[in-house]
Interface confidence: low
């Protein structure tokens, strides 16, 4: 008959690694007599028999469960009980364990050159994941520019071009790899002009071709623009290769132009522009140019459109960068500034200005203004608009109107050259010629001419409103 | 539902050491670092440091170097900051804090305060 | 050791827009993330890795980050948006955790 014997652990429980959702088995060999009973602890608290998430088989000396959990962490012992010499205990642990899973993987982006751009790639496991990123089919290489961030983002700052291309990042620990999806990052790069269009000197009615070539990520568009406004005679072609647009302008020149190549792409709501530009000369009409710093073209304005003769060409000065939109904002500042005269003052004030900011000039002839003729400018100062002249001059005197009157676009009626020495050398203003008769009340004002130079005057049904300040200086 | 519960409000005598504990809830708590970051009256945030749970791997702010100490205890997901040799100037509140996969915070523990008083 | 300067106070009447600026050597270079917390509170996370909101987090809480200024841009501010603000950055050098100095938003 065998003697009692006290129970004795011959294998100690062991520290056990185990991933979530498999099993875990601790083995606790007892040698005994009689057969020990045993029984299991957590972490000092007794393991139940009936517990279905455990399974205790061999006699109670295996303890399997059956699939762990982040919370069956901890210590787990064993204690052996034969009624002979005390009970005894071999504790181990429980270490769960966690293959990496990737929790916030990255997304695809678009990006503009030059900005910074972040992949997020957030991972959970146990050992802490290391994240590494892969471009392409190779490992990202960390510099400057480009870092994987403690939080396992990929952080490219100053994104360039060759930064485009499809990424992933890896999530690895000692229990294994886990890979995100491959992500697209779009660098978008703003509209740039690769070869402007270039200036030409050419013959009257000769034909040109304006070539201005952008690129951009989104390809660009190409628009154009002549003196200002959208090109309104010419052909356009277009082509597109590789990112790189190609626009060609055919034009039939009949007048000196500044043409304007704007090229344009979107980056989501915003727009990002470019611009070069090319001037188109007439070669006959250069030998005077030094004299007659502008060209000859068709009023495309508002606030004259009323005054000047239906398609007749005016001057445009290109000592403005640029002239027609220069010489409107001119006029439409002298009439927002105009306070009101009298209607008699109104329309003279209206004719006289806009024929003196927008001068007759024809083709075919050097581009020199053709500037009001001086009686037509007494008229307005001397008889139409003589009270508010008056006024104006008076309050110039007390120093009231010192700051800027020299940039009113209004001309010095004495240096303006008189029609009876060469009618052809100067503007007639056809508002103001009507029989002066028609004038119910003529100031008495000393005229610096002889009122025969006074023309005979007609009334006028325009109504633009002139403030002294601005029409008679 | 994640949570970091800390333990209450402590008075202590300069000179001496406070323990304060962060247990945490609803997550692997050997998953994630843990941060230490205190605030005095008035003041702004000042972090401390961490401690890796799982390998019981500190850093610690130069500020703090040699009088505190991060513990952790990864049987029950609680860790544990001690500061010694306290002075009036540690008077302030002590927050846990972890970030779950992010290098930011997102989850806070509701603050300890501790006073230093003679 | 990093340093990150923010404005002591910011104020914004209702339904305006609030900016609070975060200054460090090359931040853009750095994640940034910001805080918000009420008095008696624990801090919040409104924006981390320069312009992520957390789940729960309104839209009308956005930020950026360059060169040497991050921003947090509270849009269409409300009276609850009133509170302290701190910016934060993991030093990769030291391995360290920094905190801006904080800034106060009072709504008006």
């Known amino acids: 008959e065998k003697l009692p014997k006290a129970p004795v652990i011959t294998t100690p429980l062991e520290t056990v690694d185990a991933l979530v959702e498999e099993v875990a088995t601790f083995m606790c060999a007892v040698e005994s007599y009689p057969q020990p009973e045993i029984s299991w602890t957590r972490n000092k608290i007794l393991i139940k028999l009936f517990d279905t998430r455990y399974s205790i088989r061999e006699n109670g000396q295996l303890l399997t469960i059956l699939s762990v959990e982040d919370s069956d962490d901890g210590i787990y012992c064993c204690i052996a009980n034969n009624g002979v010499g005390g009970a005894v205990e071999s504790c181990g642990a429980l270490q769960v364990k966690m293959k990496p899973k990737i929790t916030r993987p990255p997304i695809n982006v678009k990006i503009i050159e030059g900005l910074k751009a972040v992949l997020p790639c957030t991972t959970m496991g146990n050992p802490k994941p290391s994240v590494s990123w892969i471009k392409g089919d190779n490992a990202l290489r960390e510099n400057s520019r480009i870092a994987v961030l403690e939080s396992g983002s990929l952080r490219i700052h100053n994104v360039q071009k060759e930064d485009a291309g499809q990424y992933r990042c890896v999530a690895k620990n000692s229990l294994g790899t886990a890979y995100s999806k491959l992500v697209k990052l779009e660098v978008e790069v703003f509209a740039r002009i690769l070869r402007a269009p270039e200036s030409h000197n050419v013959t009257f009615g000769s034909f040109v071709t304006l070539r201005c070539t952008a690129i951009g990520i989104p390809v660009p568009t190409i628009s154009w623009i002549e003196n200002g406004n959208a090109v309104s005679s010419g052909s356009i072609q277009e082509s597109v290769k590789d990112r790189v647009i190609d626009s060609r302008l055919q034009l039939f020149i009949t007048k000196p132009g500044l043409y304007t190549c704007i090229a344009t792409n979107k980056h989501g709501e915003k727009f990002s522009t470019a611009k070069a530009a090319a001037t188109v000369s007439i070669a006959e009409w250069s030998k005077s140019q030094k004299d007659s710093q502008g060209y000859c073209a068709q009023y495309r304005g508002e606030v004259c459109d009323a005054v000047l003769a239906k398609d007749a060409l005016v001057f445009f000065n290109t000592s403005y960068r640029d002239p027609e939109d220069a010489q409107e904002l001119l006029i439409h500042t002298a009439w927002n500034e105009l306070k009101a005269v009298s209607p008699l003052c109104r329309p003279a004030a209206e004719a006289l200005l806009c024929n003196h900011l927008f001068q007759e000039c024809s083709p075919g002839v050097v581009p020199t203004p053709m500037p009001i003729c001086r009686e037509y400018c007494l008229a307005v100062k001397e008889l139409f608009c003589a009270k508010e002249w008056q006024a104006m001059e008076g309050k110039a005197h007390r120093g009231l109107y010192r700051s800027g009157m020299h940039l009113l676009p209004v001309p010095e009626c004495s240096k303006l050259p008189s029609m009876h020495r060469d009618p052809t050398a100067c503007t007639r203003l056809p508002y103001l010629d009507y029989k002066k008769e028609n004038i119910t009340t003529f100031p008495s004002i000393t005229s610096s001419r002889p009122s025969a130079d006074i023309p005979n005057l007609p009334a006028s049904t325009s109504s633009f409103a002139v403030s002294p300040a601005y029409s008679m200086t | 539902q994640v949570h970091l519960v800390q333990s209450g409000a402590e008075v202590k005598k300069p000179g001496a050491s406070v323990k304060v504990s962060c247990k945490a809830s609803?997550?692997?708590?050997?998953?994630?670092?843990m941060h230490w970051v205190r605030q005095a009256p008035g003041q702004g945030l000042e972090w401390m440091g961490w401690i890796n749970p799982y390998s019981g791997g500190t850093s610690y702010a130069q500020k703090f170097q040699g009088r505190v100490t991060m513990t952790r205890d990864t049987s029950i997901s609680t860790a544990y900051m001690e500061l010694s040799r306290l002075i009036s100037d540690d008077t302030a509140v002590y927050y846990c804090?972890?970030?779950?996969?992010?290098?930011?915070?997102?989850?806070w523990g509701q603050g300890t305060m501790v006073t230093v008083s003679s | 050791s990093y340093v990150l300067t923010q404005p002591p106070s910011v104020s914004v009447a209702p339904g305006q827009t609030a900016r609070i600026t975060c200054g460090g050597n090359n931040i853009g270079s750095k994640s940034v993330h910001w805080y918000q917390q009420k008095p008696g509170q624990a801090p919040v996370l409104v924006v981390y890795d320069d312009s992520d909101r957390p789940s729960g987090i309104p839209e009308r809480f956005s930020g950026s980050n360059s060169g040497n200024t991050a921003t947090l841009t509270i849009s269409r501010v409300e009276a609850g948006d009133e509170a302290d603000y701190y910016c934060?950055?993991?030093?990769?050098?030291?391995?360290?955790?920094?905190f801006g100095t904080g800034t106060k938003v009072t709504v008006l």
């Open positions: 804090a972890s970030g779950l996969g992010i290098s930011a915070f997102d989850i």
């Open positions: 609803g997550y692997t708590f050997t998953g994630y670092y």
């Open positions: 934060q950055v993991w030093d990769r050098s030291s391995d360290h955790y920094v």
